[in-house]
């Protein structure tokens, strides 16, 4: 058993049929010694008396808010949550496996630049009685500070018969050094509580590996005289790190016909313009990637050819 | 070349070669990011590699003030990785195919380090740890980890040379 926060405790249980459970001793936070009784949740049934209460925690029915009283007055509360371990593996019932980039990916994180700011998100099908708390640091043995905001519901989607809820959080490294080569990864820890179930999820990454630039901006076409060719030009996204002579991007320009089956013409360039042939009903798209480190490509910025 | 006493290197040549290094480092092992290295007794085996840190003057402001600190750090790293790529970790079993990009990567590391430091002048170099794995799978694990950290190192070096070529070239 360990304290999650003031008056909230997590009981770690090996979860299998007829498991013996865990013996827990609760102590009433009061100077009083006599006439103390204990109840669980809204029930008025007295579970025991005295300054301490010993319980055997085996299942969710044994978890909840234990309250000690004296003469009708509440003295203190202890909320017990359960953390299940099945076959030596902690349960992951609350969050959905996003399976990208690999199985058992519950948290996904992205950064738009090297400033030390990043966003993480996760998915669940649970709509109520759900709370999240996020902590982060750079490194684990001698952690350096990362400040995370509160997790918020950022999207709702319908997937078949189910509703899926996306939560996200923004974090900022306290003393970021955008030009340095990271040697210690960022660690993100998410505590999830659904009713009386506790679970924790972690992710470890370097900012360089989660970089995904915003799409190029101000994508424009300039027809070239007496030619089917056009000059496509664009700019670095506003959110990308500066100076651009240092934090350089590379670009992929694609000409795509109306039909998905049509052959795509692709050009790669380090410049912010390119000359391509504009076909009728086609569109021109441009995306960006860090020039020197193969992290994710941005989403496409597109304009129609006509 | 970075001549002793602090005159400028051939920024444009260094830019071109460092960008080539980036390409080679990724072609040597593009899958490296998707390998599940954790289950292989993933004790930190590449902690001793030289990293370009915050105080090394490799940021745009530090380069403007005095690029020599940063260039020395980059040179140190290039020599370190060049030695690693020439060691038993990469020459031992399982052997790399003759057309593996590791050979080109090794030669390019040497080429860039020589551009930075002419014959006859010696910046101090970092000692290379004696990592001689007893098991072939450990050698593979080390290769992946070394290539992974090399990718990060050469990315910073390439940014330095690109910025230098754009803003510091005479």
């Amino acid at each position: 058993i360990w304290e999650l926060k003031k008056d909230v405790y997590v009981v770690e249980l090996d979860w299998y049929p007829d498991a013996p459970g865990e013996m827990v001793v609760l102590t009433c936070d009061t100077p009083e010694e006599d006439g103390i009784t204990w109840t669980l949740d809204q029930s008025s049934e007295v579970l025991g008396s005295g300054k301490t209460l010993t319980i055997q925690v085996k299942e969710f029915g044994d978890a909840g808010q234990y309250t000690c009283h004296k003469g009708g007055e509440v003295l203190s509360h202890s909320l017990l949550l359960l953390h299940k371990k099945e076959d030596g593996i902690w349960s992951t019932d609350i969050l959905k496996d996003q399976k990208e980039p690999k199985n058992k990916t519950f948290l996904r994180c992205e950064a738009k630049n090297y400033s030390g700011r990043f966003t993480c998100w996760w998915l669940t099908t649970i709509s109520t009685d759900l709370t999240f708390s996020v902590k982060s640091s750079r490194g684990s043995s001698d952690p350096q500070g990362v400040t995370c905001g509160a997790a918020t519901l950022s999207a709702e989607r319908v997937r078949g018969d189910n509703k899926e809820y996306e939560y996200s959080v923004e974090c900022q490294e306290d003393s970021a050094c955008p030009a340095a080569e990271e040697s210690l990864p960022i660690e993100v820890m998410v505590d999830a509580v659904h009713k009386l179930k506790y679970e924790n999820y972690t992710s470890s990454f370097f900012i360089r590996d989660i970089i995904k630039p915003d799409p190029p901006k101000n994508l424009q076409l300039k027809p070239l005289k007496n030619s089917r060719q056009v000059e496509v030009s664009w700019e670095y996204p506003d959110t990308w790190s500066t100076p651009h002579s240092y934090f350089s991007l590379t670009f992929c320009v694609q000409v795509q016909g109306k039909s998905k089956r049509e052959k795509k013409d692709r050009v790669f360039t380090d410049k912010t313009s390119a000359t391509v042939i504009c076909r009728k009903n086609a569109s021109i798209s441009v995306r960006a990637q860090d020039r020197y480190y193969s992290s994710s490509w941005s989403e496409w910025a597109s304009v129609p050819c006509s | 070349r970075a001549v002793p006493g602090g005159s400028s290197p051939a920024w444009t040549q260094c830019q071109q070669l460092s960008q080539k290094l980036c390409t080679l480092a990724w072609s040597a092992h593009p899958l490296v990011g998707h390998m599940d290295l954790r289950e292989e007794g993933d004790e930190e085996t590449t902690n001793d590699v030289p990293h370009i840190q915050c105080g090394d003057g490799c940021d745009p402001q530090g380069l403007r003030d005095n690029s020599q600190f940063c260039l020395q750090r980059i040179h140190q790293g290039l020599i370190f990785y060049e030695k690693l790529l020439g060691s038993d970790i990469f020459t031992g079993e399982p052997s790399l195919l003759p057309d593996s990009p590791v050979g080109q990567l090794h030669a390019s590391l040497l080429g860039l380090s020589q551009l930075l430091q002419p014959e006859g002048h010696h910046w101090e170099t970092q000692q290379i740890p004696s990592l001689s794995p007893s098991q072939p799978w450990q050698r593979l694990l080390l290769r992946f980890k070394i290539l992974r950290s090399l990718q990060a190192f050469v990315a910073v070096a390439a940014r330095v040379f690109a910025h230098g070529a754009a803003t510091l070239s005479p």
Partner: antibody, heavy 126, light 111 residues
Amino acid sequence: QVQLVQSGAEVKKPGSSVKVSCKASGYTFASYGITWVRQAPGQGLEWMGENYPRSGNTYYNEKFKGRVTITADKSTSTAYMELSSLRSEDTAMYYCARAEFISTVVAPYYYALDYWGQGTLVTVSS
Amino acid sequence: DIVMTQSPDSLAVSLGERATINCKASKKVTIFGSTSALHWYQQKPGQPPKLIYNGAKLESGVPDRFSGSGSGTDFTLTISSLQAEDVAVYYCLQNKEVPYTFGGGTKVEIK
């Protein structure tokens, strides 16, 4: 075509040594390793060790506690396996095999004992 | 050392029937979660062994009635339809860790 030709059968006294040769042809000797495997009469296979001429690395089965020495002569494309302090339980068929052990981007681990010698019967008897 | 345990020791199967050979390692012999360092060899009487399955790949020239599966510590070689020429002893070999080790062998016969 690839061939591994081993030296002839040997009868040895306990405590003595035996040196078995394995002459390779039909491929670039230095590009592959040579593995030695033995098989006692009616028994299974036992890996003794292997040598890679290109890297100069040799791997041994510690079970033989320094009794086995594996070498290769690149100039004659011949590999050798010497076993000393022979005892009766060393009576076995000794095989050499070509070892291809490579790493690529797509398949990080490829190991094949793809061509074998005909075997050399070593009998240890007093 | 990694101990390789093969089962059964011997197996009698009718022609055209399926034969399944198991190999269990005392330690994981997959690398990076997926790549297998487990190989299968076939040995016919009076001959040296012959490689039939390399990691997760059937060697060229080996009939596709042979298939290998498994990861971690448990591996299986299956002959989907046994032919007379498949009568042999089959060995698994791990080369994740030196010393490389063979299983004890499984003798496949016709019932």
